[in-house]
């Protein structure tokens, strides 16, 4: 039975040209995290594997940095980066947990972070 929950940074906003950290945290389970995949809509951005470490998709290498932890840092943000991001936790023996983050990249200098929320 899957008992864990994923806490994410929720709905966040950031300035064009700036950077943002996408962060998820798996709690309430003793399952072993074997891999975390980061996706932007239908694009694989990066993978962090317990044995192999990080793989950043070549097309994002210039603007995506691994970490902190199992999170992902997006740099040199553009308005095209606005959208949904998913952290997909592959765990043993539970299976797969998915968290969602919505990022809005703003032209203005006013960019506020949304509240944290949980996805069961």
């Amino acid at each position: 039975m899957m008992t864990g929950t994923i806490e994410t940074t929720g709905n966040i906003s950031a300035e064009k040209g700036g950077s943002i950290i996408l962060q998820c945290h798996l709690s309430s389970t003793t399952a072993q995290v074997t891999q975390v995949n980061w996706e932007q809509q239908d694009q694989l951005l990066a993978i962090c594997n317990a044995d192999l470490g990080w793989h950043i998709s070549p097309s994002f290498k210039d603007r995506v940095a691994p970490g902190p932890g199992l999170g992902l840092t997006l740099q040199s943000l553009t308005v095209n980066d606005t959208g949904e991001y998913f952290c997909i936790y592959h765990t043993y023996p539970d299976g797969t947990y998915t968290g969602r983050i919505f990022l809005e990249v703003l032209e203005s200098s006013v960019a506020e972070h949304g509240a944290r929320f949980q996805i069961p």
Partner: antibody
Amino acid sequence: EVQLLESGGGLVQPGGSLRLSCAASGFTFSSYAMSWVRQAPGKGLEWVSSIKSNTGSTYYADSVKGRFTISRDNSKNTLYLQMNSLRAEDTAVYYCAREPYSVWLDYWGQGTLVTVSS
Amino acid sequence: DIQMTQSPSSLSASVGDRVTITCRASQSISSYLNWYQQKPGKAPKLLIYAASSLQSGVPSRFSGSGSGTDFTLTISSLQPEDFATYYCQQSYSTPLTFGGGTKVEIK
């Protein structure tokens, strides 16, 4: 240089058994998921089974479930496929392949031919 | 199971031609789509992984695109060594499944 070398193929009668081996070298074998993929003569590719690195979790195609067993010996850098209750439709070239991040198959062995016939 | 449908099943082309092969998944697979090249009597060779990433050592005339259910492999200028059979494969979920293959022949 990454190398995968399959062995153990041959001619076997229906209902018989074979054990395939895949000797790996040139990389840290224990860190990678591994898969078996087969190809019947003149046909396309068919995934058979996978085994994860860190958990040893195993996965099988429905066509072989209950008959085939995938395993690995990280101390020997070797992947295995135990094939029981073989059928004529299992006749194929069997390839082992490395599966980084369980997303793609980046290195393949040269294959070993299994023929099931009476 | 996720079905992968490749088209065409075969095509004839000349050296220098631009060649496009398509692959459609029966459900969304995000970008978990890989392309392989296989020559007779040889093992498959990875060309493109995660829909659009070029595998190390593969010539840049090969490119991949698409996401969700529809994907494309393009060879920008066909070379003599490119005559082979090409397969797509999804890794979104097990069982891993392959397309039926596209045989690229000399016109």
